[in-house]
Amino acid sequence: CKAMHVAQPAVVLASSRGIASFVCEYASPGKATEVRVTVLRQADSQVTEVCAATYMMGNELTFLDDSICTGTSSGNQVNLTIQGLRAMDTGLYICKVELMYPPPYYLGIGNGTQIYVIDPEPCPDSDF
């Protein structure tokens, strides 16, 4: 059976600057030339889109200018970076991959990466 499997790390800790990076890797059942990658956030039973990008195989991944995501692609692997995260953004981030062209279409969804974000402690006032 032809199926698409998506792998991503179970847990990632965001940096003190609110940046989290993880790899989303997919096993492609066909030779896709156009791929769409979407990052979804699942909180309770609600799923919301964080960012999405479509790329041609061999080309760079380009998110919209106002997106909080950036990324690079290499073969069937996408390196995703989410910026501007705060403690309230802690949650499960799901990588969704769609093989858009040529047909047939394939859908793949990862199990999600739990991203933990800890807001940095404010610097104490110091006397000089």
């Epitope: 199926a3 859908l107 969804i109």
Partner: antibody
């Protein structure tokens, strides 16, 4: 609230054309794939066509390929189905449906009836 | 194309009884991308279950889905009067998207 409303159905003669519309509201239309699904009287559901996001990628069921064209206008939050060379077997209720974030068809319109008869 | 076969075609039960509906795929359904829909006469289908076992928003917990690979089941633990309808399974992991032929749950 999230809603899909179809229009454009009616009675048409074999070989003629019809265009269906589906007006979307309550969500970011361009972020979702949109499908047409039909149901012949007393029969089950049959997937017809899909159009993705920016409208460049489309897929069709073999039964309508070359006769039907799916399109969308993201600025108007509207999905279309242009149906040409209609046949009696195209008689059905046509539903538009949203492909949810996790893939299943989570929102459906109320349907519009298309009858192809001489 | 993945062909989905539902059984039985019709299920005659009384309110309060348990309903078990089956959906069998001609080949393995990718990542369990299988959904169940409920349709009442004159109405559009409504999503009940996605991902084989996850309940859609607002669906009562008497509806549950299970299964993987090629065999899937929708269970309604205690039938309420409003549950008598036609139920369809669907795979959405690859094109073409396909539906089963439906199972009608009717009042005995």
């Amino acid at each position: 609230q999230v809603q899909l409303v179809e229009s454009g159905g009616g009675v048409v003669q074999p070989g003629r054309s019809l265009r269906l519309s589906c007006a979307a509201s309550g969500f970011i239309f361009s972020s979702y794939g949109m499908h047409w699904v039909r149901q012949a009287p007393g029969k089950g559901l049959e997937w017809v066509a899909v159009i993705w996001y920016d409208g460049r990628n489309k897929h069709y069921a073999d039964s309508v390929k070359g006769r039907f064209t799916i399109s969308r206008d993201n600025s108007k939050n509207t999905l279309y189905l242009q149906m040409n060379s209609l046949r009696a077997e195209d008689t059905a209720v046509y539903y538009c449906a949203r492909s949810g974030s996790l893939g299943a068809f989570d929102i459906w319109g109320q349907g519009t009836m298309v009858t192809v008869s001489s | 194309e993945i062909v989905l076969t539902q059984s039985p075609g019709t299920l005659s039960l009384s309110p309060g009884e348990r309903a078990t509906l089956s959906c069998r795929a001609s080949q393995s359904v990718s990542s369990n991308f299988l959904a169940w829909y409920q349709q009442k006469p004159g109405q559009a289908p409504r999503l009940l279950i996605y991902g084989a076992s996850s309940r859609a928003t607002g669906i009562p917990d008497r509806f549950s889905g299970s299964g993987s690979g090629t065999d899937f089941t929708l269970t309604i633990s205690r039938l309420e009067p409003e549950d008598f309808a036609v139920y369809y399974c669907q795979q959405y992991g690859t094109s073409p998207w396909t539906f089963g032929q439906g199972t009608k749950v009717e009042i005995k």
